[in-house]
Interface confidence: low
């Protein structure tokens, strides 16, 4: 039928930056790049009726349907969801085509189903049918990869049981400390999943999906470095597999390295040993204690021996459930308007947390560095001197953990004023918490330095929303001050604000902002 | 080796029910899903559906829905497919087959059951 | 649910010539992750399915280099560069995007 018009759905991802929640038909989000949903003529069906290529869409994703429409003339249109009408605003774009929208924030359940979208042009009445579902990720894992000896080698195999399954990486490096960061030119990755170069100084296993990445470090005892002030400690849960490599180098190949779990010689069966030449015709070693799964009596502290070095030892610590080790008592701060400072938390923890910032319902990325003595570290340094509450959560499989933080920004007050008939008020949010005086404005006083000291109420500080403190002060009007100018000044150990108020009869009240150092 | 061994041909009537087992072997039976297809005599493949053998999550096809139940036995790495309200057309060869991932690219098939209904 | 079509349905070689299979999806198989979720399967007759090609263009272990797939988002083509007796069979595209996982008519190559 040549009267019908060209029909062009599309589907438009958006980055989501917007915690709200509902159907609108205006772009409150950054798109991706509009994904064609094909739009074909239902066959069959009584009417002209398209139907689009089924939408599924990622939980809590926000998305645009649009339709794009090339007919002649003006367009009414209306969509119906679950037997209910929704507004729908058609506008043109620069090809004078006909647009139509229906944007779903934050996918949910009650979200999912078939959109209609009736449209009528000057020409022909016409349906389109959108059918949205939600991604089936209810099969989805990820969890974190573990190593196995793989059989009749010597080579390392990186497992991590997840679903969809992950793509596996090595991520080794050969240098110390902060060069051996992601994304450092000395990190080399390998997507496979067995190693065979065991011999390198940093070595991690990563997995990745669908619903991220997730790292196992293969725990390394130097035997040619200064051990650290604490002894290092490694915990795992029972029934997980546990892998310690002892590395060292000599001069030449004349010396053997041994463990022993609480002086007693590992079993054969739970080690193996591995040796090649460095530079300089020094030889390395390598020898790894593995336990399959482990059990309880597994704990304890294991140690490498070498014939020509210095042993050194790690604490084993095998528990039943994770944990998140802190102390969660609430931190208050208070700090200058331009002073550096962070908030930090120091905890152990096991499996690794995840682990988030808040302020003010949004949050930020955390990040958390391992210490020395086992302890790891977060810190939050971008606060922008916004006084308020900070929330700190981390999380793991088995346990949770939050810490709240109050920062308080000394500065001078800065003072508001409201007046009604019978009253008028002043706040302000300086910090420390301000005292109040009112002063009234006459003949006698003209500098405005009589004080007032009946009807004044201070009220007690009032905490805005996020942990903002605000004080306030409420003069009742009297005849005595009827008609005349009154100052209201807060002040703290930075500074004092006042603003003036004319107490008038009922009607709109002038106010004069007046600030004094 | 990796293998998938099915259980034998089954002859059922109009209305009963089937069910076809697929034992795995030769590798961790939990790390790969497992799904089920279908091919009437003659005719191309059909995809019936999924199970997820490290905790049991299935997905159907639309088509199977409501007839169609997929388990799995840890202890004896085998999975299982069932049948029920069978009719002519159902009569198919059903074969099980892994999954590297759960986005298809099945590396691995049974050798098929042969499923007949008649009465 | 997404629909595969395949073409030719039928596939006459001459040994030792080239042969090249198209398959069509009716949406785009590219997912966000950079991959296209497109698989090749060969029924030998009398025999069960075989992976031949996952991911597009990634030859399964154990499949001969003769074999290779190429295309992205909605066309794909499955070639084989000197095809060999035992290459008979049906040849399936399957999308595995979105469930239900659907596979193409089939095509079946047969020598000449």
């Known amino acids: 039928n040549q009267d019908l018009p060209v029909i062009k759905c599309v589907l438009i991802n958006h980055k989501n930056n917007d915690s709200s929640v509902g159907k609108s038909s205006s772009y409150p989000m950054v798109s991706e790049s509009p994904e064609d949903l094909g739009c074909a003529l239902r066959p069959q069906s009584s009417g002209t009726v398209y139907e689009a290529a089924a939408v599924e869409v990622d939980v809590s994703a926000s998305i645009t349907l649009q339709v794009l429409v090339d007919a002649p003339g003006n367009i009414s249109c209306l969509w119906v969801f679950k037997h209910s009408s929704l507004n729908c605003q058609p506008h043109f774009d620069l090809q004078n085509r006909g647009v139509v929208s229906m944007v779903i924030l934050k996918m949910t359940e009650t979200q999912a189903g078939e959109y209609l979208l009736f449209i009528q042009s000057e020409a022909t009445n016409y349906t389109i049918l959108f059918t949205v579902s939600i991604r089936n990720t209810l099969l989805y894992t990820l969890r974190r990869p573990y190593f196995r000896k793989m059989e009749n080698q010597d080579a390392l195999v990186c497992i991590s049981e997840s679903v969809p399954e992950p793509i596996v990486e090595w991520v080794l490096c050969d240098s110390q400390g902060e060069s051996c960061k992601e994304e450092s030119p000395a990190v080399v990755k390998k997507e496979e999943k067995v190693l065979h170069e065991l011999f390198g100084m940093d070595i991690r296993c990563c997995a990745r999906n669908e619903l991220g990445r997730e790292c196992t470090r293969l725990f390394t005892i130097d035997l040619n470095q200064t051990p650290q002030t604490t002894l290092p400690q490694l915990f795992l849960k029972v029934g997980e597999p546990l892998w310690i490599r002892c590395k060292a180098v000599h001069v030449n190949h004349g010396f053997g390295l041994t463990w022993e779990l609480e002086n007693k010689a590992l079993e054969e069966g739970n080690y193996f040993e591995m040796s090649t030449y460095s530079t300089n015709r020094t030889m390395i070693r390598i020898l790894f204690a593995f336990v399959s799964s482990v059990a309880r009596n597994d704990t304890g502290y294991y140690t490498c021996s070498s014939s020509k070095h210095p042993s050194q030892s790690a604490l084993v610590t095998i528990v039943e459930k994770g944990f998140i080790n802190a102390t969660n008592s609430s931190e208050d701060y208070e700090i200058d308007q331009y002073e550096e400072f962070c908030f930090s938390v120091r905890f152990k923890a096991y499996p690794q947390i995840r682990c988030t910032w808040t302020f003010s319902r949004k949050s930020f990325p955390c990040e958390q560095k391992g210490l020395d003595n086992g302890y790891s570290i977060s810190k939050f340094c971008n606060h922008k001197h916004q006084p308020g509450e900070y929330i700190f959560h981390a999380e793991n499989d088995d346990a949770q953990f939050t810490k709240m933080f109050t920062l308080n920004i000394r500065r001078k007050p800065q003072v508001l004023a409201e007046a009604s008939a019978s009253q008028a008020s002043c706040f302000s949010d300086g910090y420390p918490l301000p005292s109040w005086t009112w002063k009234k404005c006459s003949d006698k006083s003209p500098n405005c330095t009589e004080e007032i000291t009946e009807g004044v109420w201070n009220r007690k500080a009032n905490r805005k929303v996020f942990g903002q403190w605000v004080s306030s002060s409420t003069l009742n009007m009297s005849e005595a001050i009827k008609g005349f100018l009154v100052k209201c000044c807060a002040y703290n150990s930075l500074g004092t604000s006042c603003e003036t108020i004319l107490l008038n009869s009922p009607g709109p009240f002038p106010f004069i902002q007046d600030n004094i150092s | 080796q990796v293998q998938l061994v099915q259980s034998g041909a089954e002859v059922k009537k109009p209305g009963a029910s089937v069910k076809v087992s697929c034992k795995a072997s030769g590798y961790t039976f939990t790390s790969y899903y497992m799904h089920w297809v279908r091919q009437a005599p003659g005719q191309g493949l059909e995809w019936m559906g999924i199970?997820?053998?490290?905790?049991?999550?299935?997905v159907y096809a639309q088509t199977f829905q409501g007839r169609v139940t997929m388990t799995r036995d840890t202890s004896t790495s085998t999975v299982y497919m069932e049948l029920s309200s069978l009719r002519s057309e159902d009569t198919a060869v059903y074969y099980c087959?892994?999954?590297?991932?759960?986005?298809?690219?099945?590396?691995?098939w049974g050798q098929g059951t042969m499923v007949t209904v008649s009465s | 649910d997404i629909v595969m079509t395949q073409s030719p349905l039928s596939l006459p070689v001459t040994p030792g010539e080239p042969a090249s299979i198209s398959c069509r999806s009716s949406?785009?198989?590219?997912?966000?992750?950079?991959?296209?979720?497109l698989d090749w399967y060969l029924q030998k007759p009398g025999q069960s399915p075989q992976l031949l090609i996952y991911l597009g263009s990634n030859r399964a272990s154990g499949v001969p280099d003769r074999f290779s797939g190429s295309g992205s988002g909605t066309d794909f083509t499955l070639k084989i560069s000197r095809v060999e007796a035992e290459d008979v069979g049906v040849y399936y595209c399957?999308?595995?995007?979105?469930?239900?996982?659907?596979f193409g008519q089939g095509t079946r190559l047969e020598i000449k």
């Open positions: 087959a892994r999954g590297i991932g759960s986005k298809g690219a099945f590396d691995i």
């Open positions: 399957m999308q595995g995007l979105q469930t239900p996982y659907t």
């Open positions: 949406q785009s198989l590219l997912h966000s992750n950079g991959y296209n979720y």
């Open positions: 199970i997820n053998p490290s905790g049991g999550s299935t």
